[in-house]
Amino acid sequence: ALDTNYCFSSTEKNCCVRQLYIDFRKDLGWKWIHEPKGYHANFCLGPCPYIWSLDTQYSKVLALYNQHNPGASAAPCCVPQALEPLPIVYYVGRKPKVEQLSNMIVRSCKCS
Amino acid sequence: ALDTNYCFSSTEKNCCVRQLYIDFRKDLGWKWIHEPKGYHANFCLGPCPYIWSLDTQYSKVLALYNQHNPGASAAPCCVPQALEPLPIVYYVGRKPKVEQLSNMIVRSCKCS
């Protein structure tokens, strides 16, 4: 799987999950989140050659098409597969509120 | 929705479904399919700016990150959303066989 275990410990050039830290204030302009100040969101990057973690029948076809037509702009793209939630703390007035923001952290990628 | 109805009748620059015809023999090397000789597979292409048909909370965050960090390589990607099957006919010896190949045609796209 193109997950953090594999991708973070390798120098994989193809589609893989990459490290990305997002600072809520600086990178998103979200000033309302009290904790954490930012988080490791990660992102997906890298080419999707033939057979590289292809998601559907269509992505297999497109990767194969791409191999037969190398100049084509039609190619599968490296996108998130498994996403995880992020617990945050913010204030409603003086009252702290703990919430899970769903689908915030990329754990693995796929070619779609 | 970024579907064929909208995308094929517009000059949309952002993420949208685009026309692509695939010839089984020439483009995939699949010689065994008797009918059709090829099909309109389509593909997804175009930038994914902030708020453009974003798929998950994560893709919203990433698009926003991208807006704050325009030079970053982390950005959502335009990928298939709705896929449809393709009926084919091939011969097993002298006997024709009709089969549905699942997830072969892109009907709409999303930013993931």
Partner: antibody, heavy 121, light 111 residues
Framework: QVQLVQSGAEVKKPGASVKVSCKAS????????MNWVRQAPGQGLEWIGQ????????NYNEMFEGRATLTVDTSTSTAYMELSSLRSEDTAVYYC??????????????WGQGTLVTVSS | DIVLTQSPASLAVSPGQRATITCRAS??????????MNWYQQKPGQPPKPLIY???NLESGVPARFSGSGSRTDFTLTINPVEADDTANYYC?????????FGQGTKVEIK
């Protein structure tokens, strides 16, 4: 160059199942049908069935329908043949063999080295 | 299923001589202008090796000493001249109809 490398020999008890693997390299795995053929000791060759890796489309010899299951893992370019409810008559060398690409049923141009499956109580 | 009958079951040939193996199908294997008949060579402990496809087309890398002929139900594999390395079992196979079937094999020995 094209290579099909099969898993090692197996000894199974009657009634059990066996799963043989065939790892392909040197060609585009999802472009060719993969066939499975067996050969009982000192006997002729018998076609079990075939699978098209890109779609998972399968065709089986009626003799093996319901007992043989063909699958693939396209991420590792590996084909699998599982045979269930084994009996002593299933003792044979099992081969994977690539179809040459023109038709579904085709001449088989590359063969694995074979996997001996012995069914014995 | 189409039944393929090979003859002879075995034959011994001297080096430099001609070896002829015949394969008779229980029904025609011709279709789309082709004869769907293939020939394979198998040596002990090895997988079958393709020799001929579509009745008469030589697989790449196969010596021109091997040739195939025939149509409909009657087919022939000829090795001329035979060499010591040709000791093996030879199988015909039809792929005109599912399931593909094989002949029972012909054992060729070099005297």
């Amino acid at each position: 160059q094209v290579q099909l490398v099969q898993s090692g020999a197996e000894v199974k008890k009657p009634g059990a199942s066996v799963k043989v693997s065939c790892k392909a390299s040197g060609y585009i795995f999802i472009t060719y049908w993969m066939n499975w053929v067996r050969q009982a000791p000192g006997q002729g060759l018998e076609w079990i069935g075939q699978i098209f890796p890109a779609s998972g489309s399968t065709n089986y010899n009626e003799m093996f329908e319901g007992r043989a299951t063909l699958t693939v893992d396209t991420s590792t370019s590996t084909a699998y043949m599982e045979l269930s409810s084994l009996r002593s008559e299933d003792t044979a060398v099992y081969y994977c063999a690539r179809g040459d690409g023109n038709y579904a049923l085709d001449a088989m141009d590359y063969w694995g080295q074979g996997t001996l499956v012995t069914v014995s109580s | 299923d189409i039944v393929l009958t090979q003859s002879p079951a075995s034959l011994a040939v001297s080096p430099g001589q001609r070896a002829t193996i015949t394969c008779r199908a229980s029904e025609s294997v011709d279709n789309y202008g082709n004869s769907f008949m293939n020939w394979y060579q198998q040596k002990p402990g090895q997988p079958p090796k393709p020799l001929i496809y579509f009745a008469s087309n030589l697989e790449s890398g196969v010596p021109a000493r091997f040739s195939g002929s025939g149509s409909r139900t009657d087919f022939t594999l000829t090795i001329n001249p035979v060499e010591a390395d040709d000791t093996a079992n030879y199988y015909c196979q039809q792929n005109n109809e599912a399931p593909p079937t094989f002949g029972q094999g012909t054992k060729v020995e070099i005297k």
